[in-house]
Interface confidence: low
């Protein structure tokens, strides 16, 4: 040990010797004598132990993505964006980190999730928890009344991933949010329709959205005899009735949150319902519910959804479920989250949900918190859950075993003999310059066979191959790679026939 | 095991400096910050600041700021704080402590050192 | 600074009976505030982590110890006391750079 400290030494007055050499300038000679001093006490010293116990790896919680892991993500990010812009949507992105003040006070329970920074400038700082509360203070600081937006990006969570299986500490999130004043549940109601174009164009399978409102939650708990300061802690309990049954979340609630068995009882009676616009009707007829004035608003704001999105199309995939209820804090009309649906075993059985895939509300505070005069702008808005999307489009495609194409490379500029290395250079410089996506293997004097090979393990469709004769008769062998059809095509014409041939507009405009 | 080991008991003069050593084991020294704490006989605590070995950044008690310096040398894993300018206010144990978190701001302190007695006195 | 107010001074509690003792930060604007750990320190001894986080119990604590509360006022609670609580409590936050600790409360035995 105390031989490597003094060997550890050495090597370090050398390198100290060398620095100087240079910075005087020394001559060439001298300092190349000094390095190999120094490259030899290096090679005595051998490997830093404490160098070989670093275990290489990305930190808790993150994950890096292959290339075909990122060309499925492109695929799924290209259906929502090309959604969120059908829709009308701007696209607006914010900092990574925020300040800490700005995220304090907005999540509830959660805030002990996110991520502090250190910062030598003396502000205190967090990364961001989603892209929502970013937004509400964008638009607060900016002074806007009136956006559609939409935002992907990723976000931070302090999350125990090893113990939430498929929970990342860093993730994407894909927001959509409409800010405005408007007529009451029209832009709520584009908010459904925008999800349900997704899941549908995703072809992910079967879902269902279930939609609630956060009065009519608050109504309900108030009826049955809950205190204010039960209000949200009750609501995450009853917010497990999708994974669990209504007797475990009644002992939760009676047990460990101290409510009184009768209070929970008449709980049950409610949340366990679940049904279309015919249990809104119901419960405006209630004698309890149809009392209280927050339950009664919310009730008919959702018959008024309802209506809407029967002209969208999409009441089908909707369901009006007591029992959702969402656990940020900053929720305050229509919550809503889409489930995706297992087989039932058995027909004549309900559809089983399998988690969330997308999920939002309405959050009419927000914006408030960060106007010094309390201002609101009334807003609402969506969130993919693309993550777990992700998941499910790599597991469907391995189990298809489909092979994902991680590049777009149209075709593979060859040559079928040596020494045209110049010739493949110029043309693949060509189709370059005319937009097309053309790659060349870094060889003098590729083998065809390896050229071929190389296309069939990319994916690339066309090989444009040059030879001798080709290069005296001013054409081009293109060669189709899954059919090895081949055909001599003009120079010229090219870049036309590439394009016609892989479905590219023949402009690039 | 996680331990935190401090250098022996100190007498000074008013005037001088002194410089504590916390020396850790049982975890990776640079994953953690190790922050200085002190109590005056019969007194409550206080914080002074920590260092974060890992870059080396330090967050300050603007009270200690410039009497107070924290450095840390990674290759012994042990953690140093020096007070300069001593008063016979600064008689205290001091201890040294590491940050329950490896994030930012909001440590609590899971492990102590067992505490360096400074006594300032002419 | 933020000001830890800790109350009682000091508490004389019968074995088996419960002790609570309270803790109050001052300019601490937010109710989801819950940065507060709390520190049991028997005579000759350094502090000894308790609670973190308002509510978590740090590993190896008998559960006999709690904290709740938010915002600024939190609660250390010991269920039923033992003759081996008999220590000097502290409460500490650590919201914004300088983490502050209160006063302590003495904690007796009746």
């Known amino acids: 040990m105390a031989e490597r400290a003094a060997l550890e030494e050495l090597v370090k007055l050398q390198g100290e010797r060398v620095r100087g050499l240079k910075q005087q300038k020394a001559s060439a000679e001298l300092i190349e004598e000094e390095v190999a001093k120094l490259l030899k006490l290096k090679a005595q010293l051998g490997p830093d132990e404490s160098k070989q116990k670093f275990v290489l790896k990305t930190p808790k919680g993150t994950r890096d993505y292959s290339p075909r892991q990122m060309a499925v993500r492109e695929k799924v990010f290209d259906v929502i964006i090309r959604c969120f812009k059908r829709h009308g949507a701007e696209v607006i992105d914010t900092p990574v980190f925020e300040l800490k003040e700005t995220l304090m006070g907005k999540y509830g329970e959660d805030s002990k999730l996110i991520y502090d920074l250190k910062d030598q400038g003396g502000e205190l700082l967090s990364l961001r928890y989603d892209l929502t509360v970013p937004f509400a203070r964008y638009l607060a600081m900016n002074k806007l009344t009136n956006i559609k937006r939409y935002h992907i990006a990723k976000v931070y969570r302090r999350d125990n991933p090893a113990m939430t299986r498929g929970r990342y500490r860093e993730f994407y999130q894909c927001d959509f949010d409409i800010a405005g004043n408007f007529d009451p549940m029209i832009p709520d109601a584009e908010c459904l329709k925008i999800m349900c174009e997704i899941l549908s164009s995703l072809q992910i399978g079967d879902f269902l959205v279930k939609v609630n409102d956060r009065r009519i939650l608050d109504g309900m708990f108030a009826i049955c005899g809950v205190s204010d300061s039960k209000f949200r802690t009750i609501c995450s309990s009853v917010d497990k009735l999708d994974k669990v049954s209504w007797e475990e979340v009644k002992n939760e609630m009676v047990g460990e949150k101290g409510l009184a068995p009768e209070v929970a009882d008449r709980i049950g009676d409610y949340v366990q319902q679940h049904g279309g616009v015919s249990l809104v009707e119901q419960l405006l007829q209630d004698p309890k519910l149809s009392q209280n004035k927050q339950a009664l608003e919310g009730l008919g704001d959702l018959k008024l959804l309802f209506e809407y999105l029967t002209l969208f199309g999409i009441d089908d995939k909707i369901s009006f479920d007591l029992s959702l209820a969402r656990g940020l804090d900053y929720y305050t009309g229509v919550i809503y989250e889409a489930v995706l649906l297992q087989t039932p075993a058995q027909a004549g059985e309900e559809p089983l949900g399998v988690g969330s895939v997308a999920a939002g509300g309405r959050y009419d505070g927000l914006v408030g918190m960060f106007d010094p005069k309390g201002r609101k702008v009334p807003c609402v808005g969506l969130s993919i859950g693309v993550e777990r999307i992700f998941s499910i489009v790599e597991q469907r495609l391995e189990a298809l075993e489909e092979k994902i194409r991680t590049t777009e490379t149209q075709v593979l500029v060859a040559s079928a003999q040596k020494k045209l290395l110049e010739e493949r250079l110029k043309l693949v410089s060509e189709l370059w310059d005319a937009g097309i996506k053309a790659e060349l293997l870094y060889k003098k004097n590729p083998k065809l066979l390896n050229q071929l090979q190389y296309c069939e393990e990319a994916g690339i469709p066309l090989v444009a191959i040059i030879g001798e004769q080709e290069l005296k008769d001013g054409v081009i062998k293109l060669r189709s790679v899954t059919s090895r059809e081949e055909v001599d095509v003009r120079r010229e014409d090219l870049v036309e026939e590439i394009k016609r041939r892989t479905g590219q507009p023949l402009c690039i405009c | 095991q996680v331990q935190l080991v401090q250098s022996g008991a100190e007498v000074k003069k008013p005037g001088a400096s002194v410089k504590v050593s916390c020396k850790a084991s049982?975890?990776?020294?640079?994953?953690?910050?190790i922050g200085w704490i002190r109590q005056a006989p019969g007194q409550g605590l206080e914080w002074m600041g920590d260092?974060?070995?890992?870059?080396?950044?330090?967050n300050d008690n603007e009270k200690f700021k410039d009497r107070a310096t924290m450095t840390a040398d990674t290759s012994t894993s042990t953690a140093y704080m020096e007070l300069s300018s001593l008063r016979s206010e600064d008689t205290a144990v001091y201890y040294c402590?590491?940050?329950?978190?490896?994030?930012?701001?909001?440590?609590?302190?899971?492990?102590w050192g067992q505490g360096t007695s400074v006594t300032v006195s002419s | 600074d933020i000001v830890m107010t800790q109350s009682p001074d000091s508490l004389a509690v019968s074995l088996g009976e419960r002790a609570t003792i309270n803790c109050q930060s001052q300019?601490?604007?937010?109710?989801?505030?819950?940065?507060m750990h709390w520190y049991q320190q028997k005579p000759g001894q350094p502090p000894k982590l308790l609670i973190k986080?308002?509510?978590n119990l740090e590993s190896g604590v008998p559960d006999r110890f709690s904290g709740s509360g938010s915002g600024t006022d939190f609660t250390l609670t010991i269920s039923s006391l033992q003759a081996e609580d008999v220590a000097t409590y502290y409460c500490?936050?650590?919201?914004?750079?300088?983490?502050?600790f209160g006063g302590g409360t003495k904690l007796e035995i009746k």
């Open positions: 986080y308002a509510s």
């Open positions: 300019s601490v604007s937010t109710s989801t505030y819950n940065y």
């Open positions: 500490q936050h650590s919201w914004e750079i300088p983490w502050t």
């Open positions: 049982g975890y990776t020294f640079t994953d953690y910050c």
């Open positions: 260092i974060c070995p890992g870059d080396a950044y330090t």
């Open positions: 402590a590491r940050g329950e978190e490896q994030l930012g701001l909001r440590n609590a302190m899971d492990y």
